[in-house]
Amino acid sequence: APVPPGEDSKDVAAPHRQPLTSSERIDKQIRYILDGISALRKETCNKSNMCESSKEALAENNLNLPKMAEKDGCFQSGFNEETCLVKIITGLLEFEVYLEYLQNRFESSEEQARAVQMSTKVLIQFLQKKAKNLDAITTPDPTTNASLLTKLQAQNQWLQDMTTHLILRSFKEFLQSSLRALRQM
């Protein structure tokens, strides 16, 4: 039987069935998303040569993808739990429009793209429960997101392939940094 998030199992005969802690659950959720990204990257790399593109070429993109910086307090030096948590949640909210863009970009991994999108929404909910200072979290403007989505979808094929590759690579890096930081909390 399922143990709903944050609730105790009523099965006293099996003490080992206590539910996952909040930290365990978040850890698993991130690894679940990373697994989906890995499958999507496999399809992207098989389909195009984007994965071999030089870092310089990738750096030329004009996508404003969330990235961890020193000031965000998520690195070991200058670690700040609250600042970092706000950055992680804000970053995930900003990634949502890019995950929406990915939805029609895959043929054989369509289900994986959906899984990444849905499980990211769940992760955001888990982290929002953990955050004390929700006021500091800025939600992206829906109108801005809608026009960004339209712009991305209007790109030529090569740019769309490049955009897909960059989103997956950046999201993977962001989640890996988040995972390391959250394990310190």
């Epitope: 143990v3 996952l20 690894r31 679940y32 499958a39 289900e111 849905m118 992760l123």
Partner: nanobody
Framework: AVQLVESGGGLVQPGGSLRLSCAAS????????MDWYRQAPGKQRELVAS???????MAADSVKGRFTISRDNAENMVYLQMNSLKPEDTAVYVC???????????WGRGTQVTVSS
């Protein structure tokens, strides 16, 4: 909902082997990440091994090289092959499924493994 039923536990001598099975009901098995946990009396629950949806595996340091986790998506099964068993492996072994779509975890009732001469 997902129901999990473990089997394959028992009494085994040190150095021996066992293969645990976990049968899952439900149509969403292929989207579940699967784990084996264990809990010895008076001890903390310990993650033994994990297998992701795509088949990526992970094993705890204490069992690396001895225990192997695998899954069969066609049969809705997860296995834990345990070799070179030691007395300290004695515990209740529990199968757990994690659904990232909902963030829910599902637990079996466990199967007892006792390693003793």
């Amino acid at each position: 909902a997902v129901q999990l039923v473990e089997s394959g536990g028992g009494l085994v001598q040190p150095g021996g082997s066992l293969r645990l099975s976990c049968a899952a009901s439900g149509s969403i098995f292929s989207r579940l990440a699967m784990d084996w946990y264990r809990q010895a009396p008076g001890k903390q629950r310990e993650l033994v091994a994990s297998i992701s949806r795509s088949g990526t595996t992970m094993a705890a340091d204490s069992v690396k090289g001895r225990f192997t986790i695998s899954r069969d998506n066609a049969e809705n099964m997860v296995y834990l092959q345990m070799n070179s068993l030691k007395p300290e492996d004695t515990a209740v072994y529990v199968c757990m499924a994690f659904d990232g779509y909902s963030g829910s975890d599902y637990w079996g009732r466990g199967t007892q493994v006792t390693v003793s001469s």
